[in-house]
């Protein structure tokens, strides 16, 4: 119904009031709910109303505004500090102590974050985005610099329906359409072999506690696991001779361990250095990501930071020790 210049929506009635004609919803059941468009941001709850805009938002602090779009910094919150002597003593010993696994303590001096002391260094959001990994979308953190809010703004994160099958057939040079989705890792790009690669700038350099032969044997699972976390596809980089860039890594033992090793007499034939793991160089191929998502990494910096963020949360399924992003073509370093 309408009266004068006012156009009322389906189910609404036009009421003449002292301040002119107004639309009114006699029965919210029969009217379009203003909550249908999910207007309340940052976890605010939406309540249907009988008058325009037909909703009201109950905002979760520190947000306010008609759509919870405004961030209000809490009054004079003192900056968090890492006061504990315990944490000072335990930082950078290669072991993650949960009690020190906080932003203020640099994630136990990098022990909990793959040696990266501030994965959110480039995040300029007014929110402390490391505290907003909470299974709900926080738009102020949904930027590449803020690590896409840990991919919590992707709607309900779907799981791969035929996960076991897709894991077994990942990157096997045969396209399985049932696995050709973001949640299944796009079948390791098996269905995109005819498409041009779309490489992110830079290289991810990862140290993982698996010897090279074991890592290469398990490469498909390894790449799928990391690709799942990064919502894109990864591949092992090749050197100028076309060889896969997976090298033995001999570790960086603590001073105490080095001393113990030196005092232990070497047996005949015993190797000088034991292989502790592998250093692997990875590239990001966004050829499928860019078709399905606007949350793709243009370079490897934020991808490295996101892996560090997963280490902080304890959600890595491989024994990663460190991750760095290299911008230039690396020399073979160990």
């Amino acid at each position: 119904s309408s009266c004068g210049q006012v156009k009322c929506r389906k189910g609404e009635q036009c009421v003449h009031t002292a301040s002119g004609p107004r639309c009114f919803c006699p029965s919210p059941r029969d009217c379009e709910s203003g909550c249908a468009s999910s207007p309340c941001q940052h976890g605010g709850s939406c309540h249907p109303q009988r008058q325009p805009p037909y909703y009201s938002c109950q905002c979760a602090p520190p947000f306010s505004g008609s759509r919870c779009e405004l961030y209000t910094a809490p009054p004079s919150t003192p900056p968090a500090t890492c006061l504990s002597q315990y944490c000072a003593d335990k930082a950078r010993d290669g072991v993650c102590d949960e009690a020190c696994n906080s932003h203020a303590c640099q994630w136990d001096g990098g022990d909990c974050s793959l040696t990266m002391e501030n994965p959110w260094a480039n995040c300029s959001s007014p929110l402390p985005c490391w505290d907003y990994i909470n299974n709900q979308c926080d738009e102020l953190c949904n930027t590449v610099e803020c690590l896409f809010d840990n991919f919590e703004c992707q709607g309900n994160s779907k799981t791969c329906k035929y996960d076991k099958y897709c894991a077994d057939h990942f990157k096997d040079n045969h396209c399985d359409q049932g696995c050709n989705s973001e949640e299944c890792g796009w079948d390791g790009l098996d269905c995109a072999a005819d498409q041009p690669e779309n490489l992110a700038e830079g290289t991810l350099v990862i140290v993982v506690l698996m010897p090279p032969e074991q890592l290469l044997q398990d490469a498909r699972s390894f790449l799928r696991a990391l690709g799942t976390l990064l919502h894109t596809n990864l591949r092992i980089k090749r050197d100028s001779q076309g060889e896969l860039m997976v090298y033995p890594y001999y570790g960086e033992k603590s001073a105490a361990m080095k001393k113990q090793r030196m005092t232990r007499r070497s047996l005949p034939g015993e190797q000088e250095q034991e292989v502790a793991g592998s250093k692997v160089f990875l590239e990001i191929d966004n050829r499928q990501c860019v078709q399905d998502s606007d949350h793709c990494f243009k370079n490897t910096d934020a991808a490295a930071a996101l892996l560090a963020s997963h280490a902080i949360q304890g959600t890595l399924s491989y024994p990663l020790v460190s991750v760095v992003s290299e911008s230039l073509t690396p020399e073979r370093t160990q």
Epitope: G94, V95, D97, E98, L209, A276, G277, P319
Partner: antibody
Framework: EVQLVESGGGLVQPGGSLRLSCAAS????????MSWVRQAPGKGLEWVSY????????YYADSVKGRFTISADTSKNTAYLQMNSLRAEDTAVYYC???????????????WGQGTLVTVSS | DIQMTQSPSSLSASVGDRVTITCRAS??????LAWYQQKPGKAPKLLIY???IRASGVPSRFSGSGSGTDFTLTISSLQPEDFATYYC?????????FGQGTKVEIK
């Protein structure tokens, strides 16, 4: 199959020394932290010490600090507990146990050995 | 050090009973709490970690809940093989500490 086997327990006089061994198999030894946990006869469990074989970082309970030394030989996939200046109150079954969370001391212990008895008595 | 207090120290129950054991920490350990089962002469066995996650191979009748300072282990329907001693353990801050144990006996 992931397995831990302790050895080296026995009877020792107060003030004496003993070295316990924990041989690990069925998993990547360097990747996971390892703890020693003890249980005095008829009593509860007490955490003793932790090592992360990859970095060599070690942690100790105050009750054993300065007397016990934990170490690991990654070429043998074996963790050790060197116990010096032993006291009667160190009498217990000693278990080695693997931590479930790679380099995280803040993780539960998901695999345990069968235990080895240490008796400190004159 | 963080003190862990279990209650009760012992309890008698019958097969099929619902059994609840509580564990209280002297300060918050967030959700970094595990439950272990130990039978006489055997090593402890991990049942629950991160307060509520069942370890691999643990029957669904075992469940854990709680966070901060108060935690509960529940056995929904006690089976003959469940008669044992149960320990809680906080692993939030070193030194890791255990509760004194709860012995579950046959009534």
């Amino acid at each position: 199959e992931v397995q831990l086997v302790e050895s080296g327990g026995g009877l020792v006089q107060p003030g004496g020394s003993l070295r316990l061994s924990c041989a690990a198999s069925g998993y990547s030894f360097t990747s996971y932290g390892m703890s020693w946990v003890r249980q005095a006869p008829g009593k509860g469990l007490e955490w003793v010490s932790y090592i992360y074989p990859y970095s060599g970082a070690t942690y100790y309970a105050d009750s054993v600090k300065g007397r016990f030394t934990i170490s690991a030989d990654t070429s043998k996939n074996t963790a050790y507990l060197q116990m010096n200046s032993l006291r009667a109150e160190d009498t217990a079954v000693y278990y080695c146990a693997r931590h479930s969370g790679y380099y995280r001391i803040s993780s539960a212990m998901d695999v345990w050995g069968q235990g080895t008895l240490v008796t400190v008595s004159s | 050090d963080i003190q862990m207090t279990q209650s009760p120290s012992s309890l008698s129950a019958s097969v099929g009973d619902r059994v609840t054991i509580t564990c209280r920490a002297s300060q918050s350990v967030r959700s970094f709490l595990a439950w272990y089962q130990q039978k006489p002469g055997k090593a402890p066995k991990l049942l629950i970690y991160r307060a509520s996650i069942r370890a691999s191979g643990v029957p669904s009748r075992f469940s854990g809940s709680g966070s901060g300072t108060d935690f509960t282990l529940t056995i929904s329907s006690l089976q003959p093989e469940d008669f044992a001693t149960y320990y809680c353990q906080q692993y939030y801050i070193s030194p890791s500490t255990f509760g004194q144990g709860t012995k579950v006996e046959i009534k």
